[in-house]
């Protein structure tokens, strides 16, 4: 079995700044070198949206869901078939390939299985999932995320955010 | 040694159902996804089902979804096939097959539907 | 489906190359195995698997290599017991699929 984890499932980022998204893995053996998979969804609901309105009819029933439920997350729970699915980038060996929405982007999968961002875009915000699969066991569901916001220059929101933390600001 | 035994095989009536079984063995089971494959008389490979190392997640093909369920016990290292509402068209030699990309492959089982 | 030649021929100690193309990605990659089947109704058996890895107890001679969404197998010195229906798979997200064959004639 491969046990994956996101160390660090939060991240707020400025427009343009580059950001490293860690997965750490650990298989039971090695048939042959894993597969890592990083897929981008996007958030199923609007995250900096409910943050500049936290009083809002939707967001009452959201902490009503999530009081029942202390693992509910309504901005990742939601089917694939209502969101945007893309795959980010594949590494197999020391092969990387972007995914063809990605490519020309200054992305790439670095150490075993991080996800890095050069330069973050708008339409960057979402949940990235990494998942780890042995070549001969390509769909075994061994994923963990992390939720990703790209906010501009002058976006008060990371301190809105409760929960998350802002990346250093750099130029 | 990779050995893959199916079993279950045999004459089988139209609107029946099938419970075909496979016995793996000489490997870490769990590690791997599985699959099985069928072939109509004079006729290519076909594609039934898999399901992942853990069981989490199958897949059907197109002619059996929706009659087929496809599970595994771990513990015991067998994959199961069973095939509902069983039509002429099912009769072949069904294949249990080990990984994603198969690198493995059972000495098969024969069904026929018929009445 | 996938698309692979009907036959090829061969003379022995001669190279070939047989071709396999139309299967689609999976999470944004390409996955192929190649099977020989000796008679109809007989067990395939695998040559190729994960689009370069060769079995054990495979000879040597039998490689595989994949560009783009085409996977090619090649026997380089075909014997004259290589002579078979040679099958493609593929692995993509609605499951797997396999091309209807290439007779190995040698």
């Known amino acids: 079995a491969i046990q994956v984890t996101v160390p660090d499932p939060y991240h707020v980022v400025i427009l343009f700044q580059p950001v490293t998204l860690h997965c750490t893995y650990q298989m039971s053996n090695t048939l042959t070198a894993p597969i890592v998979i990083w897929k981008y969804k996007s958030f199923c609901r609007d995250r900096v949206a409910d943050a500049f309105s936290p009083a809002s009819v939707d967001n009452q029933l959201n902490a009503q869901l999530a009081a029942g439920n202390p693992g509910y997350n309504p901005y990742v729970e939601c089917q694939d078939s209502v969101r945007t699915v893309r795959v980010v980038a594949t590494k197999q060996g020391n092969a990387v390939t972007l995914g063809d929405y990605y490519q020309g982007r200054r992305i790439t999968i670095t150490g075993n299985a991080d996800l890095t961002f050069e330069q973050t875009a708008w339409g960057d915000s979402g949940v990235y999932y990494c998942s780890v699969v042995s070549a001969q066991d390509l769909d075994g569901n061994n994923e963990a995320y992390a939720e990703l916001i790209v906010l501009g220059r002058t976006s008060e929101a990371p301190e809105l955010l409760p929960g998350f933390r802002a990346g250093p600001l750099e130029d | 040694a990779v050995t893959l035994d199916e079993s279950g095989g045999g004459l089988q009536t139209p609107g029946g159902a099938l419970s075909l079984v496979c016995k793996a063995s000489?490997?870490?089971?769990?590690?791997?996804?599985m699959q099985w494959v069928r072939q109509a008389p004079g006729k290519g490979l076909e594609w039934v089902t898999g399901?992942?190392?853990?069981?989490?997640?199958?897949r059907y093909g197109s002619a059996v979804k929706g009659r087929a369920t496809i599970s595994r016990d771990n513990g015991q290292s067998t994959v199961r096939l069973q095939l509902n509402n069983l039509r002429a068209e099912d009769t072949g030699t069904y294949y249990c097959?080990?990984?994603?990309?198969?690198?493995?492959w059972g000495h098969g089982t024969e069904v026929t539907v018929s009445t | 489906a996938l698309t692979q030649p009907a036959s090829v021929s061969a003379n022995p100690g001669e190279t070939v190359k047989i071709t396999c193309s139309g299967g689609?990605?999976?999470?944004?990659?390409?996955?192929y195995g190649w099977y020989q089947q000796k008679s109809p109704g007989s067990a395939p058996v695998t040559v190729i698997?994960?689009?370069?890895q060769r079995p054990s107890d495979i000879p040597s001679r039998f490689s595989g290599s994949t560009s783009g969404s085409t996977a090619t197998l090649t026997i380089t010195g075909v014997q004259v017991e290589d002579e078979a229906v040679y099958i493609c798979?593929?692995?993509?997200?609605?499951?797997?699929?396999f091309g209807a064959g290439t007779t190995l004639t040698v």
């Open positions: 097959a080990r990984g994603s990309t198969i690198d493995a």
């Open positions: 000489g490997f870490d089971f769990s590690s791997y996804e």
């Open positions: 399901i992942s190392g853990s069981g989490s997640s199958t």
């Open positions: 689609s990605s999976y999470a944004g990659s390409y996955y």
């Open positions: 698997y994960y689009n370069d």
């Open positions: 798979g593929t692995y993509e997200d609605s499951g797997g699929v």
